[in-house]
């Protein structure tokens, strides 16, 4: 089998065998090595010498195989835009950000750039569970049968109605999507002023 050419090598068709780790240098019409993540080009290649790479300085990074002559500056997540950090910048990776708790991504440009407060779900509903937290605003869905939710909240979950018999009590008023079951002592009549409370 033919030995594999090692960069730098001539390329007549302007393409290189390994697109990820090599690039075409048009001035010399050769394929040269890219620099690995965490490094940058400190000396460009020539016909007789391959690319020379150097490590990114502190506080800078390059994420991919590249032929950049500089590293990108690390930037913090912007708390004013509702973002928080989940992982620090390294020489091979930019700072990883996500929306702060209770917020969702409202503006996306390759990554999230702006988060806004999740809207409240009204009583009788709850936020539909999403695969990824912070990806979109709340979509409120009604509590399923036998459950209730009595607040306006972005995060409150529907709870099962109290089963009076489990507490040795009897039902005074059935639960609704917005209120729990009202229970009473089986020996006591229900006072007329009582609504939405539990007598023990």
């Amino acid at each position: 089998s033919q030995p594999q050419a090692v960069p730098p090598y001539a390329s007549e068709n302007q393409t290189c065998r390994d697109q990820e780790k090599e690039y075409y240098e048009p001035q010399h019409r050769i394929c040269c090595s890219r620099c690995p993540p965490g490094t940058y080009v400190s000396a460009k290649c020539s016909r007789i010498r391959d690319t020379v790479c150097a490590t990114c300085a502190e506080n800078s990074y390059n994420e991919h195989w590249n032929y950049l002559t500089i590293c990108q500056l690390c930037r913090p997540c912007d708390p004013v835009m509702g973002l928080e950090e989940i992982a620090p910048c390294t020489s091979k990776r930019k700072t990883q950000c996500r929306c702060q708790p209770g917020m969702f991504c409202a503006a996306w440009a390759l990554e999230c750039t702006h988060c806004e407060l999740l809207s409240d779900c009204p009583p009788g509903t709850e936020a539909e569970l999403k695969d990824e937290v912070g990806k979109g605003n709340n979509h409120c869905v009604p509590c399923k049968a036998g459950h209730f939710q009595n607040t306006s909240s972005p995060s409150a979950r529907c709870q099962p109605h109290t089963r009076c018999e489990n507490q040795g009590l009897v039902e005074a008023a059935p639960g609704t999507a917005q209120s729990d079951t009202t229970c009473k002592n089986p020996l006591e009549p229900l006072p007329p002023e009582m609504s939405g409370t539990m007598l023990m």
Partner: antibody, heavy 116, light 107 residues
């Protein structure tokens, strides 16, 4: 060269607060994260949180949220860590450290003793 | 939180011995692991970052390896000044976490 110089030892009563300082020199204070790490006697290291002095934003380990406050004064290149509602388990050496792929630079440590 | 499990917790060795300390992460942390040496009453000193990058001024007898979840610090030939406690740390995601430490004692 990078230097982090911390304030002196403190003895505090349970329930009180302590504020430890960390003065940075030898680099641009506003462009690097400063972290706080503590070490109880004979124990391992525990990360508490960081501040980015450029925008004075801080993030904390959930374990300490509500009890720890990290601040920074850009004019003096000094970071501060305040821990409130102290208990005996908070007796430890508190370190500030500048981060980049770990903690290449550390302060000398500040011993905080909580005792009634 | 990511747990960093270091072993052994202590070991006895002689000058000239080859010493290996391991650290296991509870989930993949790539190569985002650092190693520190600490002597009594002193702040930790950085030895290794990015799992295998040795800081300038750190003797070549110290080397690090590993990626993903399994990491190793090796001292190829133990010197008298190496008797200390060693910690690993992951800086892949917050909260940063440390191993519980390995105390290297004189046999």
């Amino acid at each position: 060269q990078v230097q982090l110089v911390q304030s002196g030892a403190e003895v505090k009563k349970p329930g009180s607060s302590v504020k430890v300082s960390c003065k940075a020199s030898g680099y641009t204070f506003t462009t690097y994260y400063l972290h706080w790490v503590r070490q109880a006697p004979g124990q391992g290291l525990e990360w508490m949180g960081w501040i980015y002095p450029g925008n004075v934003h801080a993030q904390y380990n959930e374990k300490f949220k509500g009890r720890v406050t990290i601040t920074a004064d850009k004019s003096t290149s000094t970071a501060y860590m305040e821990l409130s509602s102290l208990r005996s388990e908070d007796t430890a050496v508190y370190y500030c450290a500048r981060s980049w792929e770990g903690f290449p630079y550390w302060g000398q440590g500040t011993t905080v003793t909580v005792s009634s | 939180d990511i747990q960093m499990t270091q072993s052994p917790s202590s070991l006895s060795a002689s000058v000239g011995d080859r010493v290996t300390i391991t650290c296991k992460a509870s989930q993949n942390v790539g190569i985002n692991v650092a190693w520190y040496q600490q002597k009594p009453g002193k702040a930790p000193k950085s030895l290794i970052s990015s799992a295998s990058y040795r800081y300038s001024g750190v003797p070549s007898r110290f080397s690090g390896s590993g990626s993903g979840t399994d990491f190793t610090l090796t001292i190829s030939s133990l010197q008298p000044e190496d008797f200390a406690t060693y910690f690993c740390q992951q800086y892949d995601t917050y909260p940063f976490t440390f191993g519980q430490g390995t105390k290297v004692e004189i046999k």
